[in-house]
């Protein structure tokens, strides 16, 4: 069971990143699915290595004081959403913006029907060029 | 099937990074090989988690306007080389140069004879000290 | 065999990061253990994908000239400690400090009783908020 999906620019104002099965994507079988273009949902309980990479372009003066944060989040059936992993990068002083890349990854137990998704502080700063921003998992 | 190889400084003017089976490297068996010191080639079709880490030292004034970009690339038999993953980091204002590390990783389907390699915008900026720059894969 | 442990603030002046089985941690079975809150120790020989993520907050003026370095280290029975992976990030000019995240990961052969741990140049700069700093492994 494995998946690798590719970032998709979105007009939605949500902080949840959107993904697509496009380009050089992976969707090994129907035991993992991409739902609503926003979350990877697994049908089997077990340990999964889950990862995300986010490239973004921001400028200190044009952004809030707070850093750019990418969060890998979990929603299990009948449970609250919770944060599994986070990474933070202070905005660049480069103009018009400075690119930076974040990588998140870890091993987590997922229940049947559990979904994982990626949140960012400012989706408008995310780079959607080929290969820059992606999201995936593999079952151990 | 798994491999982990270590960066090697090169006098070549190519943007493709060079690697060696040295130090604490891994080469599990002959189903994955390091070819010409530049690419990991697999003999078996299947899903692989492929990763690379690149540490570099650069300065904004001494570098081009463009960011430092590391790309994980694929060459399949009878196909074009193509980019699987990219990460970008704007150059530091630190002098003489500021170090930064990039990590790339994802799950991809590889065909028999497929090769993966790592490209960077400026190989002269790459750090080759112990553990700073490496490249590997594992078959799921 | 898999583990994922969560960073723990420590009053110790050591450069070795401390970890805990808390929050959304993973400890698959007793073939991998967290020892003294500082190292993951494995009982079985084999290939492991080992990873660490460290988020830190630092300022160029308040820090040493040297960059922030995170190192993934190995201690095998009857052997010297050695560095497997390192990442380096120059300190930010942001005030009071600028956050940055480092991700390390690679495939390594471990012997029975081998331990892996994470060293940083300045543990006081490490961010221990939920999900920011973690450490884990999985057996292939």
């Amino acid at each position: 069971i494995a998946a690798h999906v590719i970032s998709e620019a979105s007009s939605k104002t949500t902080s949840v990143l959107q993904w697509a099965e496009k380009g050089y994507y992976t969707m090994s079988n129907n035991l993992v699915t991409l739902e609503n273009g926003k979350q990877l949902t697994v049908k089997r309980q077990g340990l999964y290595y889950i990862y995300a990479q986010v490239t973004f372009c921001s400028n200190r003066e044009a952004s809030s004081q707070a850093p750019f944060i990418a969060s890998l989040c979990l929603k299990s059936p009948g449970r609250f959403e919770r944060i599994l992993l986070r990474a933070a990068n202070t905005h660049s002083s480069a103009k018009p913006c400075g690119q930076q890349s974040i990588h998140l990854g870890g091993v987590f137990e997922l229940q049947p029907g559990a979904s994982v998704f990626v949140n960012v502080t400012d989706p408008s700063q995310v780079s959607h060029g080929t290969g820059f921003t992606s999201f995936g998992l593999l079952k151990l | 099937i798994a491999a982990h190889v270590i960066s090697e400084a090169s006098s070549k003017t190519t943007s493709v990074l060079q690697w060696a089976e040295k130090g604490y490297y891994t080469m599990s068996n002959n189903l994955v090989t390091l070819e010409n010191g530049k690419q990991l080639t697999v003999k078996r079709q299947g899903l692989y988690y492929i990763y690379a880490q690149v540490t570099f030292c650069s300065n904004r004034e001494a570098s081009s306007q463009a960011p430092f970009i590391a790309s994980l690339c694929l060459k399949s038999p009878g196909r074009f080389e193509r980019i699987l993953l990219r990460a970008a980091n704007t150059h530091s204002s630190a002098k003489p140069c500021g170090q930064q590390s990039i990590h790339l990783g994802g799950v991809f389907e590889l065909q028999p004879g497929a090769s993966v390699f790592v490209n960077v915008t400026d190989p002269s900026q790459v750090s080759h000290g112990t553990g700073f720059t490496s490249f590997g894969l594992l078959k799921l | 065999i898999a583990a994922h442990v969560i960073s723990e603030a420590s009053s110790k002046t050591t450069s070795v990061l401390q970890w805990a089985e808390k929050g959304y941690y993973t400890m698959s079975n007793n073939l991998v253990t967290l020892e003294n809150g500082k190292q993951l120790t494995v009982k079985r020989q084999g290939l492991y994908y080992i990873y660490a993520q460290v988020t830190f907050c630092s300022n160029r003026e308040a820090s040493s000239q040297a960059p922030f370095i995170a190192s993934l280290c190995l201690k095998s029975p009857g052997r010297f400690e050695r560095i497997l992976l390192r990442a380096a990030n120059t300190h930010s000019s942001a005030k009071p400090c600028g956050q940055q995240s480092i991700h390390l990961g690679g495939v390594f052969e471990l012997q029975p009783g081998a331990s892996v741990f994470v060293n940083v140049t300045d543990p006081s700069q490490v961010s221990h908020g939920t999900g920011f700093t973690s450490f884990g492994l999985l057996k292939l």
Epitope: G23, Y24 | S76, R82, Q111 | -
Partner: nanobody, 118 residues
Framework: EVQLLESGGGLVQPGGSLRLSCAAS????????MGWVRQAPGKGLEWVSM????????YYADSVKGRFTISRDNSKNTLYLQMNSLRAEDTAVYYC???????????WGQGTLVTVSS
Amino acid sequence: EVQLLESGGGLVQPGGSLRLSCAASGFTFQMYPMGWVRQAPGKGLEWVSMIEPAGDLTYYADSVKGRFTISRDNSKNTLYLQMNSLRAEDTAVYYCAKYQEQPWFDYWGQGTLVTVSS
């Protein structure tokens, strides 16, 4: 059903230019890499060029680098190949292709003939 319809071929003198177009239907065009393949008389198939779904990365065979430019308009489901400085050896049937690596399978159009001759 996947359909790829090429147009724009014809007879051109050496050094001349042509622009090929490919109208795609039956699939979500913007999700797939697209490319051009050619077959010269009596020869095998040769990949000429490929473009990623976002249109930001392009790949070319050494034989056409610097002379051919691939592009796409995802809003119109159309792929293009601008061919400049044409040579006799570029004479071939040019096929538009939906480039796919999982599963390992490509869809082709019917092709358009390009003849470079004085």
